[in-house]
Interface confidence: medium
């Protein structure tokens, strides 16, 4: 994250981390059901473990932290590298989330964002770019929904209704390592960071989103196929 | 029910190559969700076991025992099977060699082996 | 390098009695440990995993514990079935190994 400040404790419980060994993370993701993590289809690797209820980067001991393995990668069916349409996978963890105030899923909203919405993106990515610097601890971020034209305009021929944009001041933006995690919108979960410029956080290119509100059904029916 | 088969193994000259196949039923290697990884593990006659490599089928990448890096390839050759390659044999490579595979849900332990074959080089 | 040191080499217990197995990491491996049991011509069968956690099928007499570099497999009760070696493994890191395995615990029951 770009410009943005260390989130308030405990205020986001469905952030978790994926890790590579020993405890390297690569990507953002999140809770969205007891068992069940969203993250974004290119962050799939098979071998990594899941941390939640964690607030530091570094693998330092918190006392609300649960880890997980992924049992499960399930990417959308429509998700084909190179590209970005589709750009989500569902993971099952081993076992269910212990709820607790640092551990809880978030709802994935059923409605469309539209422009101007405020959101919240989270991560903890470098917080610098093109240079790479990651933080101490979970960053957040306040960023608008801009509309699919504003959007297609910064990013020509490579926009669907499978994502949509967001940003807010130049300077401000998610980045490297961030993937994967959430955009919330109004309490719920509209996004998962996507792709974007490089270097992050460029005027007029902003972070570019999964749009979940068109894969509620295809979540809900994947969670009920494979619990 | 998971099993693992190890094959290849036999009589072979010093400075010589051989590859031992894992051959796998009742999974895939190419399994697009489940979460594993396989590996070889070898043991010396009368000594402990040693790991030597494993690979993850979903992406195919690898890692390799510092020792064992540039002498000895694993790959997954097919739906079902896993190789190793060894390459400039002496008489400390004779062993036993197992496959094995590890799943997400045992954090990777290795929960499945093959009875192993036993590699002598003479 | 992480290098696991396991001790001790051998140890022989009575039917009945308990069997205390140590193995220390040369540096912190959470709590990524896992113990084997291998009989002679078997091949290894998997006890516990994430230093704690029973693996399937597995009599709860073995029991690990530990954290960080310190671990530990109790074995209680003992049976003339537990005569075998017992390896620990470490999964915290597959950078930079020698060998993920410890050196190996041989428990005779007499």
């Known amino acids: 994250i770009i410009n943005g400040s260390d989130c308030d404790m405990h205020t986001q419980p469905w952030q978790a981390a994926l890790l590579l060994r020993p405890n390297q993370l690569y990507c953002g993701a999140v809770l969205v059901h007891p068992q069940w993590l969203l993250t974004a289809a290119h962050c799939r690797k098979k071998v990594f473990r899941v941390r939640l209820g964690h607030y530091s980067l570094s693998p330092v001991y918190e006392s609300g932290q649960q880890m997980f393995q992924g049992v499960k990668s399930i990417p959308h069916p429509g998700y084909s590298h190179p590209g970005h349409s589709n750009d989500l996978m569902l993971i099952k963890l081993n076992r269910r989330i212990r709820p607790t105030k640092d551990v809880r899923p978030i709802n994935v909203s059923s409605h469309c964002p539209s422009a101007g919405t405020k959101c919240l993106v989270s991560g903890w990515g470098t917080t610098k770019s093109p240079q790479v610097h990651f933080p101490k601890v979970l960053q957040c971020l306040n960023i608008s929904v801009l509309s699919q034209k504003r959007c297609e305009d910064a990013y020509p021929r490579q926009i669907d209704d499978t994502m949509f944009c967001a940003g807010d001041k130049a300077g401000r933006d998610s980045c490297q390592g961030d993937s994967g995690g959430p955009v919330v919108c109004n309490g719920s979960l509209q996004g998962l960071v996507s792709w974007g410029d490089y270097p992050c956080a460029r005027p007029n290119r902003p972070g570019v989103y999964t749009n979940l509100c068109k894969f509620t059904k295809w979540i809900q029916e994947t969670i009920q196929a494979n619990s | 029910q998971e099993q693992l088969e190890e094959s290849g193994g036999g009589l072979v000259k010093p400075g010589a190559s051989l590859t031992l196949t894992c051959t796998v039923s009742g999974f895939s290697l190419t399994n697009n969700y489940v979460n594993f990884v396989m590996c070889w593990v070898r043991q010396a006659p009368g000594k402990g076991l040693e790991w030597i490599a494993s690979i993850d089928p979903g992406d195919d990448s690898t890692d390799y025992a510092s020792w064992a890096t540039g002498r000895f390839t694993i790959s997954k050759a097919s739906s079902t099977t896993v190789t190793l390659q060894v390459t400039s044999l002496t008489a400390a490579d004779t062993a036993t060699y197992f496959c094995?595979?590890?799943?997400?849900?045992?954090?990777?332990?290795?929960?499945?082996w093959g009875p192993g074959t036993l590699v002598t080089v003479s | 390098a992480i290098e696991m040191t396991q001790t001790p080499s051998s140890a022989s217990e009575p039917v009945g009695g308990t069997v205390t197995i140590k193995c220390q990491a040369s540096?912190?491996?959470?709590?990524?440990l896992s113990w084997y049991q291998q009989k002679p011509g078997q091949p290894p069968k998997l006890l516990i995993y994430?230093?704690?956690d029973l693996a399937s099928g597995v009599s709860s007499r073995f029991k690990g514990s530990g954290s960080g570099t310190q671990f530990t497999l109790i074995i209680s009760d003992v049976e003339c079935a537990d005569a075998a070696t017992y390896y620990c493994?470490?999964?915290?890191?597959?950078?930079?190994?020698?060998?993920?395995f410890g050196g190996g615990t041989e428990v005779v029951v007499k």
């Open positions: 493994q470490q999964d915290y890191s597959r950078s930079n190994i020698v060998n993920s």
């Open positions: 540096e912190s491996i959470s709590r990524y």
């Open positions: 094995a595979r590890g799943d997400a849900g045992t954090s990777y332990s290795f929960n499945f």
């Open positions: 994430d230093a704690s």
